[in-house]
Interface confidence: low
Amino acid sequence: MQKGDQNPQIAAHVISEASSKTTSVLQWAEKGYYTMSNNLVTLENGKQLTVKRQGLYYIYAQVTFCSNREASSQAPFIASLCLKSPGRFERILLRAANTHSSAKPCGQQSIHLGGVFELQPGASVFVNVTDPSQVSHGTGFTSFGLLKL
Amino acid sequence: MQKGDQNPQIAAHVISEASSKTTSVLQWAEKGYYTMSNNLVTLENGKQLTVKRQGLYYIYAQVTFCSNREASSQAPFIASLCLKSPGRFERILLRAANTHSSAKPCGQQSIHLGGVFELQPGASVFVNVTDPSQVSHGTGFTSFGLLKL
Amino acid sequence: MQKGDQNPQIAAHVISEASSKTTSVLQWAEKGYYTMSNNLVTLENGKQLTVKRQGLYYIYAQVTFCSNREASSQAPFIASLCLKSPGRFERILLRAANTHSSAKPCGQQSIHLGGVFELQPGASVFVNVTDPSQVSHGTGFTSFGLLKL
């Protein structure tokens, strides 16, 4: 892609951050070995990646979590990659589901999501999970990013 | 990307290779339907992908393994994507963890890792696992690659 | 990539479609939040993505399925990303395997596949699974796509 000023590279990779908030939206930070190519993509409120230019983007997220079947709800652990475009409804782009482990105290599992989507200027993407308290925040376990084609 | 000579495509995809070595670093080969775009990325010592040009790269790995909870250690199976840059410490870029299966003799699981990272000239990336003897080397199950944005 | 007319962006993202066919090849549709950049990539017969231009492509698939160990065969659930090029071998590019869950009535699991491959003009890629009746077709759970480097 190695583009000129007219067409700069746009890419981001942010790192999960434990949060005391009870929201299902995961929190992220520009810490560790993160990527933020320029101001054409930004991390807003620690929760969403927002792009300034329209175009096709490969968007991905990885979530590692630790859960136990007996201690969790019947429903599986679900991670969702969601889109909010200005003046539009929020929508789910991608989801992955993993049934809780029978391992005790909890069993770790990792989910990876990724796909190519058209984003409008000002569009934001974020990651939702069924239970953020189960997410693993150790180095490299949970991350979120995008790259503009 | 379809770039000119000044800015060639740089991409690699290599295939897992069973190894008698006891190291936790996975071994790879240019075999089967592999990709090696040019000499700006190379597979060194069968274990690491090394790049000659600085820039943003999407790096990924997939590891399929077969393990059993009773026959394995308490700790989960962990796959790590690691970076070694000239004159710098090694660091973990991405990790995924899966608790061992209760299936017998072993239960298969697949892990996928991927993210966008800035690499320096001469930087190498490699994949570590907790138990290489559990990795599946059948066609397509375990692979490793990158592409330059 | 933001390319000129000589070198347009080529990308696709299609959404899983439940099928009454007994074939192991998954069916896809241009529905929901899909991507089809132009006619240089097409979805043929609802089952394969076919490209018109030679080059390196990042190809990916995500499959979510729900299965139970007692109700399924001994063999794990396997998803395969396959390639058919004119006058060449049909071949497996990537595979992932997950042992069936012990959860009842079934346990959900998600598989992600992705890698960089050289495609010839007229080459088609498709996704095979061991049991298509176990695949989850809820919003965002199962998808398939590619992007040209």
């Epitope: - | 075999k31 089967g32 059948g138 397509g140 | 060449r88 071949r91």
Partner: nanobody, 114 residues
């Protein structure tokens, strides 16, 4: 130099069987995928079967259940067992070795006729 030499072709009656062999030399056999193609008179060469370096097989729909491909790494040889042969299987059968490049044998003629 890569060399592929086919053998085992011949005349067989419908419903009969043949086993083709492809002896390979000049490359690391276990690092390559081996396959068979065929070309009937007046037609284009078409894929028949392939076996990957990991032992995974694939077949053209027209031969599934009748033909079996295999490879013996110790002998650097690939095989195509052809059962329940039909007149439409008549063709020159070519062995192929493929990694990033493609190498062909010279072909062996299979004629299915009563």
């Amino acid at each position: 130099e890569v060399q592929l030499v086919e053998s085992g072709g011949g005349l067989v009656q419908p419903g009969g069987s043949l086993r083709l062999s492809c002896a390979a030399s000049g490359f690391t056999f276990s690092r390559y995928e081996m396959g068979w193609f065929r070309q009937a008179p007046g037609k284009e060469r078409e894929f028949v079967a392939a076996v990957t370096e990991g032992g995974t097989t694939s077949y053209a729909d027209s031969v599934k259940g009748r033909f079996t491909i295999s490879a013996d790494n110790s002998k650097n040889t690939a095989y195509l067992q052809m059962n329940s042969l039909k007149p439409e299987d008549t063709a020159v059968y070519y062995c192929a070795a493929e990694s990033l490049g493609r190498w062909w044998g010279q072909g062996t003629l299979v004629t299915v006729s009563s």
